[in-house]
C-alpha cells in the first residue's frame, strides 16, 4: 500500500530512492569481485512521516505509536519494497564466474 | 543471512523484537475494531552496528557505505523479517466479522 | 573546489522569455537536489523553485507556476531555469542553489538547507 | 508580507551578543527544521545553521540557532564588524508546497 506519497518536510527528504557511487574497495569486494570497478548503489533514504508510503499494517500501528511514544518506538524507517538484479564477475579457483545477486540494488522504497 | 547475532553495543541494545502494549484508542482503531481492546504489538527496536543481523547483500552494502559516509547513507535499519497473524473482530455495517491481518505483528527482526 | 555559476541574465522586455544556466563543478552534480532562489533590488530571498537530483519531482513557487519551468542535465552538470511570460515583479538577482545532502542521526533525512550558493545573475524585465 | 516573521533590525556593539528571532506557525517553522542564511553586502547568501541548530564545518561557534514551538532564533555572541549583514531564517511550509523565508534582518555593528 503506498499511503500518501506526498512530503510534509519539503521535497526530497522523505523516503526514496538515492544513487550513491561506490568503488569495490569502499564496498571491501576488491579480493573477489573483478567487475563492475565501480557500482551505482540504489538505496532507500529519507524520513517517514506519518503514513508516508506506509508498507503495510505494522507501519501504520509503529506511526501511531510512535506519535504517542516517541522515546519508546521509532518512526518506521525507509527500506527497500523491491530490488533490481545485478550481474557481478567474480574471481574464482579456476578463473572468474558471473553471478546474479537479486538483493543488492534497491528498485522501490516504502516505510515499514 | 543472519551475519552476525553478537550485539557489540550491549545486551539488549541491537536490533530485536520488543512488546508494546497498545488500547485501540492508541492506535486509532476503536471506531472499527471490537476486539482486542488491548494488542500486544510486538515491534523491531534496536540498533543495526555492522554486519549485525544483515538482511541480504544490500545491508552489507549499506553498513560498509555508512561506514565511509555516515553523513549522506544511514545505517541499516532494524525492521520486521518476518510477521505473526493476528485476527481481529471488526464492526461492519450489518454486525461483526473476523478479519486475519498478516502483516501486523512482527515475529522476527532484521536489519536492512 | 565546490562551485556553482549562473549566467543568462540580462535585459528583457514584459512578456518576454529567458533561459538562466548554473554551471555546477567541484562536486557529483548528480547526486544532489538543487533550488533557484530570488533577490528583488533592496529586497528579501524568494525561494523560485526546486528539482530532485534525478529530475523526477519539481516545485513551484505560487508566483512563478506556470511561467517558469526548472530543468537539469546532469551529463553536463548544469541547472536550468526557463522563464516565460515575464513580468516587472520578476526582476531580480536569481541564484542557484544546492540543497546539502546531511542525514540526521537516527531519522536518516536530508537536512532542508542550501548549502552552496552562486554568485547570482541579474534579471530585468521592464520595456 | 513575508511568510516568516523576522526584526527588520538590530544593533549591538563588539564583543556583545545579539540575539534575531523567527516567528512562524504549525505549518512550517511548527512542523519542520530551520535553516538560518547570512548575506554579507554584495555577496551571495551563505548557510549558517541548519537543521534548527547545526553549523556547518567553517562556521564559528559564536553563531548558534534554537527553536522553541513556531519561533526560532539566531544568537550571535562576541560581535565582530565582519557579522554586519543581512540574517535569513527559511523553513519549508507544508501548507504552502513552499520553502518560506523570512524578511530579513540587517544587523548593525556600532
Known amino acids: 500500500a503506498r499511503n500518501g506519497d506526498h512530503c510534509p518536510l519539503g521535497p526530497g527528504r522523505c523516503c526514496r530512492l538515492h544513487t550513491v557511487r561506490a568503488s569495490l574497495e569502499d564496498l571491501g569486494w576488491a579480493d573477489w569481485v573483478l567487475s563492475p570497478r565501480e557500482v551505482q548503489v540504489t538505496m532507500c533514504i529519507g524520513a517517514c512521516p506519518s503514513q508516508f508510503r506506509a508498507a503495510n499494517m505494522h507501519a501504520q500501528i509503529k506511526t501511531s505509536l510512535h506519535r504517542l511514544k516517541p522515546d519508546t518506538v521509532p518512526a518506521p524507517c525507509c527500506v527497500p519494497a523491491s530490488y533490481n538484479p545485478m550481474v557481478l564477475i567474480q574471481k574464482t579457483d579456476t578463473g572468474v564466474s558471473l553471478q546474479t545477486y537479486d538483493d543488492l540494488l534497491a528498485k522501490d522504497c516504502h516505510c515499514i | 543471512a543472519r551475519n552476525g547475532d553478537h550485539c557489540p553495543l550491549g545486551p539488549g541494545r541491537c536490533c530485536r523484537l520488543h512488546t508494546v502494549r497498545a488500547s485501540l484508542e492508541d492506535l486509532g482503531w476503536a471506531d472499527w475494531v471490537l476486539s482486542p481492546r488491548e494488542v500486544q504489538v510486538t515491534m523491531c527496536i534496536g540498533a543495526c552496528p555492522s554486519q549485525f543481523r544483515a538482511a541480504n547483500m544490500h545491508a552489507q552494502i549499506k553498513t560498509s557505505l555508512h561506514r565511509l559516509k555516515p553523513d549522506t547513507v544511514p545505517a541499516p535499519c532494524c525492521v520486521p523479517a518476518s510477521y505473526n497473524p493476528m485476527v481481529l473482530i471488526q464492526k461492519t455495517d450489518t454486525g461483526v466479522s473476523l478479519q486475519t491481518y498478516d502483516d501486523l505483528l512482527a515475529k522476527d527482526c532484521h536489519c536492512i | 573546489e565546490v562551485q556553482l555559476l549562473e549566467s543568462g541574465g540580462g535585459l528583457v522586455q514584459p512578456g518576454g522569455s529567458l533561459r538562466l544556466s548554473c554551471a555546477a563543478s567541484g562536486f557529483t552534480f548528480s547526486s544532489y537536489d538543487m533550488s533557484w532562489v530570488r533577490q528583488a533590488p533592496g529586497k528579501g530571498l524568494e525561494w523560485v523553485s526546486w528539482?530532485?537530483?534525478?529530475?523526477?519531482?519539481?516545485y513551484y513557487a505560487d508566483s512563478v507556476k506556470g511561467r517558469f519551468t526548472i530543468s537539469r542535465d546532469n551529463s553536463k552538470n548544469t541547472l536550468y531555469l526557463q522563464m516565460n511570460s515575464l513580468r516587472a515583479e520578476d526582476t531580480a538577482v536569481y541564484y542557484c542553489a544546492r540543497y546539502g545532502i546531511k542525514t540526521r542521526t537516527n531519522n536518516a533525512y536530508y537536512a532542508n538547507a542550501m548549502d552552496v550558493w552562486g554568485q547570482g545573475t541579474l534579471v530585468t524585465v521592464s520595456s | 508580507q513575508s511568510v516568516l516573521t523576522q526584526p527588520p533590525s538590530a544593533s549591538g556593539t563588539p564583543g556583545q551578543r545579539v540575539t534575531i528571532s523567527c516567528s512562524g506557525s504549525s505549518s512550517n517553522i511548527g512542523s519542520n527544521d530551520v535553516t538560518w542564511y547570512q548575506q554579507l553586502p554584495g555577496t551571495a547568501p551563505k548557510l549558517l545553521i541548519y537543521d534548527d541548530s547545526h553549523r556547518p564545518s567553517g562556521v564559528p561557534d559564536r553563531f548558534s540557532g534554537s527553536k522553541s514551538g513556531t519561533s526560532a532564533s539566531l544568537a550571535i555572541s562576541g560581535l565582530r564588524s565582519e557579522d554586519e549583514a543581512d540574517y535569513y531564517c527559511g523553513s519549508w511550509d507544508y501548507s504552502l508546497n513552499a520553502y518560506v523565508f523570512g524578511g530579513g534582518t540587517k544587523l548593525a555593528i556600532l
Open positions: 528539482i530532485s537530483y534525478d529530475s523526477s519531482s519539481k
